[in-house]
């Protein structure tokens, strides 16, 4: 396994919809064209996995069905979008990639990113 | 280094608006937030809100909702911070901060706005 | 909102003396998320722990911090004469951000 730099902003402050947009890219040492990406959550010590992708260079990123993430790719770079947030999910959300193929296997883990997510305002009972 | 600097001090009418600007150096702009705190005369640090210089979100203190608006130039890495229908009470020094993952950082060196008749 | 509260108000002390300074909020903060600061008149705050006890950058070992949950800790092992200021605890853990009424350390 050798290690690979991975650079995600230090801060993120999601939309008022709860939707979080960031760029995880990595240092590829190689020519990847298999490549893993998984999100995974810190918070209060625990770390949970958000969701995670495997991917061909030049494809679209596929999540699961049910996953709150999509992604596109461009290079080295991974837009990743986080749905569905609510203010609990604060959180610090950290980028790990794989190059797993060919090898040999790079793992690369960024610092995190915190993203800050505000509940909306309720609306006000209005009288029709 | 992080460096943030302010313009400079300001007297302003009540009813009026002033518009604060913060220019960073010494790291990515984008990567991080840029928060608002303000300090009235002999008080404490009161917190008016912050943007995300990545995709230029905001999140504004609920006493300050509607007359206040934070923006950034990416550009030029610089942030403002626009405060309308001044009032008297409105009378502090701003600072802008670097927001980071876990912290506010590095300040800015104040700005003194003064609302006077 | 996370309210958060400091106590004493004012510390008064001589040079060479221990300061313990209280911080407590509302609901619990996790530890990664709690900060200090210092700040002296006509100066802008300085940071002096993040994550309740990480000191920052080119901040003396004298200064510590402690804590978990609502209640946090700034300690000074040994005043100087430079550290006589105000003292704020903050949060970042929850929107909005807030801070402390702060803790002034005079001589006393």
């Known amino acids: 396994c050798k290690a690979m730099h991975v650079a995600q902003p230090a801060v993120v402050l999601a939309s008022s919809r709860g939707i979080a947009s960031f760029v995880c890219e990595y240092a590829s040492p190689g020519k990847a064209t298999e490549v893993r990406v998984t999100v995974l959550r810190q918070a209060d010590s625990q770390v949970t996995e958000v969701c995670a992708a495997t991917y061909m260079m030049g494809n679209e990123l596929t999540f699961l069905d049910d996953s709150i993430c999509t992604g596109t790719s461009s290079g080295n770079q991974v837009n990743l979008t986080i749905q569905g947030l609510r203010a609990m999910d604060t959180g610090l959300y950290i980028c790990k990639v794989e190059l797993m193929y060919p090898p040999p296997y790079y793992l690369g883990i960024g610092n995190g990113t915190q993203i800050y997510v505000i509940d909306p305002e309720p609306c006000p009972d209005s009288d029709f | 280094q992080v460096q943030l600097v302010q313009s400079g001090a300001e007297v302003k009418k009540p009813g009026a608006s002033v518009k604060v600007s913060c220019k960073a150096s010494?790291?990515?702009?984008?990567?991080?937030?840029i928060g608002w705190v303000r300090q009235a005369p002999g008080q404490g640090l009161e917190w008016m809100g912050w943007?995300?210089?990545?995709?230029?979100?905001?999140n504004y203190a609920q006493k300050l909702q509607g007359r206040v608006t934070m923006t950034t130039d990416t550009s030029t890495s610089t942030a403002y911070m626009e405060l309308r229908s001044l009032r008297s009470d409105d009378t502090a020094v701003y600072y802008c901060?670097?927001?980071?993952?876990?912290?506010?950082?590095?300040w800015g060196q104040g700005t003194l706005v003064t609302v006077s008749s | 909102e996370i309210v958060m509260t400091q106590s004493p108000a004012t510390l008064s002390l001589s040079p060479g003396e221990r300061a313990t300074l209280s911080c407590r909020a509302s609901q619990s903060v996790s530890s990664s998320y709690l900060s200090w600061y210092q700040q002296k008149p006509g100066q802008a705050p300085r940071l002096l722990i993040y994550g309740a006890s990480t000191r920052a950058t080119g901040i003396p070992a004298r200064f510590s911090g402690s804590g978990s949950g609502t209640d946090f800790t700034l300690t000074i092992s040994s005043l100087q004469p430079e550290d006589f200021a105000v003292y704020y605890c903050?949060?970042?853990?929850?929107?909005?951000?807030?801070f402390g009424p702060g803790t002034k350390v005079d001589i006393k």
């Open positions: 903050q949060q970042d853990y929850n929107l909005p951000f807030t």
């Open positions: 901060a670097r927001v980071g993952g876990a912290t506010i950082d590095y």
């Open positions: 943007i995300s210089a990545y995709n230029g979100n905001t």
């Open positions: 010494g790291y990515t702009f984008t990567s991080y937030g």
